[in-house]
Interface confidence: low
């Protein structure tokens, strides 16, 4: 019968011929009376056989990632009679893996959005690298992830590539971060190959800023002839948040005379001071009122940022009008 061991050939071998092993018939007594032949895809071009001994050689550099298995056929013939000594037999040559492929991130570019002020441990995104080497061959395709840029605000789980927040971030200071992740094969051991990817992490706004008046004092004037409902001026607060988190409502905090009102222009986010009751220069020629401003939408968990609404003082001078 046929005698052989499992055949393996390492990929990327640079030698012109690499001895893989020997196949022989147990009837072969070594007197060169048998001829061995190799048939099938790769026979003669990739692999050759020593017709007398049955020794098999690889004569080309092989790439396991291109082809990991060769199925060939062997024949052994008695030279004297030209007859087959053994039935034709199929055998396999496996290409064994070396660590010749670096990890690659296939889903680039990565981009994620996470709310500002998110607590430590918040999941941001998972990045995944793949390695074309053989996952069953040692550690050639076993990856470890690490953070090259982004400390101390982000961390990455070494085995999963899950990126998490490791420190609070404020969108009003910086609204996006470039994080660089490295994947290393060989679980980081010597000879490891690596690949990197960038992750753009954008912070979405939360309502962590209260509106604050631009001025601590506003001076306005109103004619004593002005009818009720007249707009006598505007006041303005600013809010470092954006979108609906910067929408605000103005109101009167103090007006003993109950002469004025404030309405909010939600287009411009200005407060419009309105005359609620007619004024009389001869009766009272100036007024002092206090206004306050608050955000329109404040979730319960963010109320801690909105204690003590911002206030401003408004001095209103009444202009005299000649009366008939």
């Amino acid at each position: 019968g046929w005698v052989w061991n499992q055949f393996f050939v390492p990929e990327e071998m640079n030698t012109t011929s690499h001895h893989i092993g020997q196949l022989r018939s147990d009837l072969d007594n070594g007197n060169n009376s048998f001829q061995y032949k190799l048939l099938g895809a790769g026979a003669g071009s990739t692999f050759i056989i020593d017709e007398r001994t049955g020794d098999i050689y690889a004569i080309q550099k092989l790439d396991r990632e291109e082809r990991s298995l060769y199925i060939l056929r062997a024949q052994v013939i008695d030279i004297a009679t030209g007859r087959a000594v053994e039935p034709e037999s199929e055998f396999v040559i496996k290409v064994s893996d070396i660590n010749d492929n670096e990890p690659k991130f296939l889903d680039e570019p990565y981009e994620a959005i996470v709310p500002e002020m998110s607590p430590e441990g918040t999941l941001v995104i998972q990045v995944t690298a793949s390695d074309a080497d053989d996952p069953s061959s040692g550690n050639n395709a076993r990856l470890l992830y690490s953070l090259l840029q982004g400390q101390p605000y982000f961390s990455v789980e070494p085995t999963t590539g899950v990126i998490r927040i490791s420190s609070k971030m404020d969108r009003e200071l910086q609204d996006e971060y470039w994080v660089i992740i490295q994947a290393k094969d060989m679980i980081g051991q010597p000879g490891a190959l690596s690949g990197t990817t960038s992750v753009l992490i954008k912070l979405s706004d939360v309502n962590d800023n209260k509106p604050i008046f631009k001025e601590s004092l506003y001076r306005l004037t109103v004619s004593e002839s002005a009818p009720t409902g007249t707009s006598i001026g505007t006041i303005m607060a600013y809010d470092n948040d954006i979108g609906e988190n910067a929408e605000m409502d103005y109101s009167i905090e103090e007006d003993d005379s109950q002469t004025f009102d404030i309405i909010t222009n939600h287009e411009t986010q200005e407060g419009i001071v309105i005359l609620k009751k007619k004024v009389d220069f001869e009766h009272q020629n100036h007024y002092g009122i206090r206004a306050k401003v608050k955000n329109h939408h404040v979730p319960e968990q963010l109320m801690k940022y909105h204690t003590e609404a911002s206030t401003t003082f408004i001095k209103i001078q009444v202009e005299d009008v000649d009366e008939p």
């Epitope: 101390p152 605000y153 420190s167 609070k168 404020d170 009003e172 910086q174 470092n240 940022y305």
Partner: antibody, heavy 116, light 111 residues
Framework: QVQLQESGPGLVKPSETLSLTCTVS????????WSWIRQPPGKGLEWIGY???????NYNPSLKSRVTISLDTSKNQFSLKLSSVTAADTAVYYC??????????WGQGTLVTVSS | QSVLTQPPSVSGAPGQRVTISCTGS?????????VHWYQQLPGTAPKLLIY???NRPSGVPDRFSGSKSGTSASLAITGLQAEDEADYYC???????????FGGGTRLTVL
């Protein structure tokens, strides 16, 4: 490598406005936040305020009524104005870049003396 | 009066280990905001020494280390060298001010 350089007059009269400019090189100002910090002679550091590249600002409440920080992206510069100065405003003024909650690059500082 | 409290001075002999403490409150360090440390050599601008409680920028020797617990933080310097003689400042973010605060600074003297 990002570098910051403060410039402006070294002497300002009381009640006048102190004006300083910080020029950023080796990187664009159109990212990050940019701060001013000062240090009176022999004393500690005090944060004055910052401007974000979008233009939004935040100031130290103790100085807020007198401070304005502005940005000129075309020149890669940001500026500090501090009005109604007194001798207590005499200090070395530093500009710095914020990386989120800390300052990773600083200018070398410029001494401003308030005196008549 | 600084929001973050540091000892005014510490000292140590060459080769020794010294620590500098930085005590804050529930509105800064205790809220979860990081502590950062700066070294200011005489006549120069402050230089970032430790960021995010315990991270060293490239170029900073591993003799310098930082830690944080509760409302306080500390900077440790091992194998003290003459060139470590400087002022050291801690810094954090103060939520009640919506801005940054520094400690009063600690002068390190190498004996």
């Amino acid at each position: 490598q990002v570098q910051l350089q403060e410039s402006g007059p070294g002497l300002v009269k009381p009640s006048e406005t102190l004006s300083l400019t910080c020029t950023v090189s080796g990187g664009s100002i159109s990212s990050y936040s940019w701060s001013w910090i000062r240090q009176p002679p022999g004393k500690g550091l005090e944060w004055i305020g910052y401007i974000y590249y979008s233009g939004s600002t935040n100031y130290n409440p103790s100085l807020k009524s007198r401070v304005t920080i502005s940005l000129d992206t075309s020149k890669n510069q940001f500026s500090l104005k501090l009005s109604s100065v007194t001798a207590a405003d005499t200090a070395v003024y530093y500009c710095a870049r914020n990386w989120a909650f800390h300052f990773d690059y600083w200018g070398q500082g410029t001494l401003v003396t308030v005196s008549s | 009066q600084s929001v973050l409290t540091q000892p005014p001075s510490v000292s140590g002999a060459p080769g020794q280990r010294v620590t500098i403490s930085c005590t804050g409150s529930s509105s800064n360090i205790g809220t979860g905001y990081d502590v950062h440390w700066y070294q200011q050599l005489p006549g120069t601008a402050p230089k970032l020494l430790i960021y995010g409680n315990s991270n060293r920028p490239s170029g900073v020797p591993d003799r310098f280390s930082g830690s944080k617990s509760g409302t306080s933080a500390s900077l440790a310097i091992t194998g003290l060298q003459a060139e470590d003689e400087a002022d050291y400042y801690c810094q954090s973010y103060e939520s009640s001010l919506s801005g940054w605060v520094f400690g009063g600074g600690t002068r390190l003297t190498v004996l």
